[in-house]
């Protein structure tokens, strides 16, 4: 349940984090799972524990195995397992699947490739980046902090990207490499006739007289950035601004969200101190874009 796979190459540094949550003040004990033998905390050892972290400086193939970490928190001890595999260095350029971190996707607008696991290490910029084992050169590639940015991404930028950096521990330097695949996706947006998610058409909302209530108008308009997409409330067919009732206010600005890639917009109508006359009004949620206008009506009724 609380097990995490970690891998590295022989003669490189590998740092593994305990897969259980900890706090800086809580001791973490590390053990070789097979022997139950405690892992030392002294930094003179090649393999040593340092709080939440288990450090192999450098790693050897024989280090492969399962390691147990126990977070000594009050109330309950939290136990986790790190499944570590150390591989021999590959003679050729090919990086096998078992050494690959998760694939990332990019597009013309967003082409960041983060160097996997780098946050665990004590490294200094710059990172070195390679694509299919070739060092990346040219102004299109920018190594920025812990990620690579590619300008004007094209489909042939897809491939395996390796980051290489130096981990420093007490003045000693250790090399680390990590590889992940990068795929390029076509970010084609589209626009469609608005779909109102809330309220349902001809919905009735129960309210209590004297209480405050909020009505949310939420609609989706397509995928990606939209040229025109607006939602608003009307009262009896009139704009809120034309309806001189200070108790009833439409939220300033519109909250834009991307739900499952869809461009959706919300606006909230706030009614303070609900009065009997508010029950007689017709509240229209309007969603408008270049394809047209959709309207859903909601009325208020007194809570029994």
């Amino acid at each position: 349940k609380f097990s995490k796979q970690s891998w590295g190459l022989e003669n490189e540094a590998l740092i593994v984090r305990c897969p259980r949550q900890g706090k800086s003040s809580y001791i973490v004990d590390w053990y070789y799972s097979q022997t139950n033998k405690s892992i030392p905390t002294q930094e003179r050892n090649r393999v040593f524990a340092s709080g939440q972290l288990l450090k192999f400086l450098p790693a050897e193939v024989a280090d492969s195995g399962i390691y147990t970490c126990i977070v000594r928190s009050p109330t309950f001890n939290r136990t986790g397992y790190a499944n570590v595999t150390i591989y021999k260095k590959q003679p050729d350029c090919n990086v096998p699947d078992y050494l690959m971190y998760s694939t990332v996707s990019g597009s013309e607008k967003n082409s960041k490739i983060y160097c996997p696991t780098i946050d665990l290490y004590n490294w200094t910029a710059p990172l070195e980046w390679f694509k299919n084992c070739q060092a990346l050169q040219g102004s299109r590639y920018k190594a920025h902090k812990s990620f690579l940015v590619i300008d004007n991404v094209m489909t042939d930028d897809a491939g395996d990207y390796t980051c290489k950096f130096i981990h420093n521990e007490n003045g000693a330097n250790y090399s680390v490499t990590a590889t992940r695949s990068f795929t390029v996706k076509d970010e084609q947006g589209f626009s469609r006739f608005p779909v109102i998610r809330a309220p349902a058409h001809n919905e009735t909302k129960e309210v209590e007289i004297g209480e405050n209530t909020n009505l949310t108008c939420s609609a989706c308009f397509g995928k990606g950035a939209q040229f025109l997409a607006t939602v608003q409330w009307q009262l009896n067919g009139n704009k809120i601004t034309d309806f001189s009732e200070p108790r009833i206010q439409q939220e300033e600005g519109q909250n834009q969200s991307f739900s499952n890639g869809l461009a959706c917009v919300n606006t909230v109508l706030r009614i303070a101190d609900v009065k009997e006359e508010d029950l007689l009004l017709r509240y229209d949620c309007l969603a408008l874009n270049l394809h047209g206008l959709r309207r859903h009506t909601i009325r208020l009724s007194r809570k029994n």
């Epitope: 259980r20 003040s25 000594r72 009050p74 309950f76 939290r78």
Partner: antibody, heavy 123, light 111 residues
Framework: EVQLVESGGGLVQPGGSLRLSCAAS????????MHWVRQATGKGLEWVSS???????YYSGSVKGRFTISRENARNSLYLQMNSLRAGDTAVYYC?????????????????WGQGTTVTVSS | NIVMTQTPLSLSVTPGQPASISCKSS???????????LFWYLQKPGQPPQLLIY???NRFSGVPDRFSGSGSGTDFTLKISRVEAEDVGVYYC????????FGPGTKVEIK
């Protein structure tokens, strides 16, 4: 306002089942360990079960194998499924908040308690 | 299991007078993080327990300063400098070093 509201208590026959719920509001539920504590009429407080932020579960010896604690972070809810109930399980069951794992220094014990829900096991 | 004991089990106090409750644990409540996991609660009639003191001596927010906690290791004390009518109820000590255990409670009433 930080609040815990228990529900689901009632009268049940020995051997029966009941599911208690606790609705949390006013805080980031997912970052806290959560617990159930019970109190029989006129008696002291007894810890029953706990669930940590990562879903690991813990039980007192008297309920182990019969009770199951669970949480649904998306609904800000804590549950206690009680099976094979006995007369000795009759008590007020309190839902209570424990350690906050998003705050490195935070540990106020069981700092927030619900009003409790009454479970009566009787034939 | 850590066992908690409290003395006295009941206490009758004159308003304005001090009161003291003792709590002992079967083993030290000092954790490797340097903190001691001992708490005091007050349960007023018909209400859930409310936290008074955490970490032996820290007053929880909103708790009047007439309440104070002290102690270390296995021996702890809750003191009320001047008892008020609203202080009646049952006082529990609790440890959370290993799971949770409560003391049997001390019933405080006004003379």
């Amino acid at each position: 306002e930080v609040q815990l509201v228990e529900s689901g208590g009632g009268l049940v026959q020995p051997g029966g089942s009941l599911r208690l719920s606790c609705a949390a509001s006013g805080f980031t539920f997912s970052t806290f360990d959560m617990h159930w504590v019970r109190q029989a009429t006129g008696k002291g407080l007894e810890w029953v079960s706990s669930i940590d932020t990562e879903g690991d579960t813990y039980y007192s010896g008297s309920v182990k194998g019969r009770f199951t604690i669970s949480r649904e972070n998306a609904r800000n809810s804590l549950y206690l499924q009680m099976n094979s109930l006995r007369a000795g399980d009759t008590a007020v069951y309190y839902c209570t908040r424990g350690e906050d794992w998003s705050d490195d220094d935070y540990y106020y014990g069981l700092d927030v308690w619900g009003q409790g829900t009454t479970v009566t096991v009787s034939s | 299991n850590i066992v908690m004991t409290q003395t006295p089990l009941s206490l009758s106090v004159t308003p304005g007078q001090p009161a003291s409750i003792s709590c002992k644990s079967s083993q030290s409540l000092l954790h490797s993080d340097g903190k001691t996991y001992l708490f005091w609660y007050l349960q007023k009639p018909g209400q859930p327990p409310q936290l008074l003191i955490y970490g032996v001596s820290n007053r929880f927010s909103g708790v009047p300063d007439r309440f104070s906690g002290s102690g270390s290791g296995t021996d702890f004390t809750l003191k009320i400098s001047r008892v008020e009518a609203e202080d009646v109820g049952v006082y529990y000590c609790m440890q959370s070093l290993q799971l949770f255990t409560f003391g049997p409670g001390t019933k405080v009433e006004i003379k």
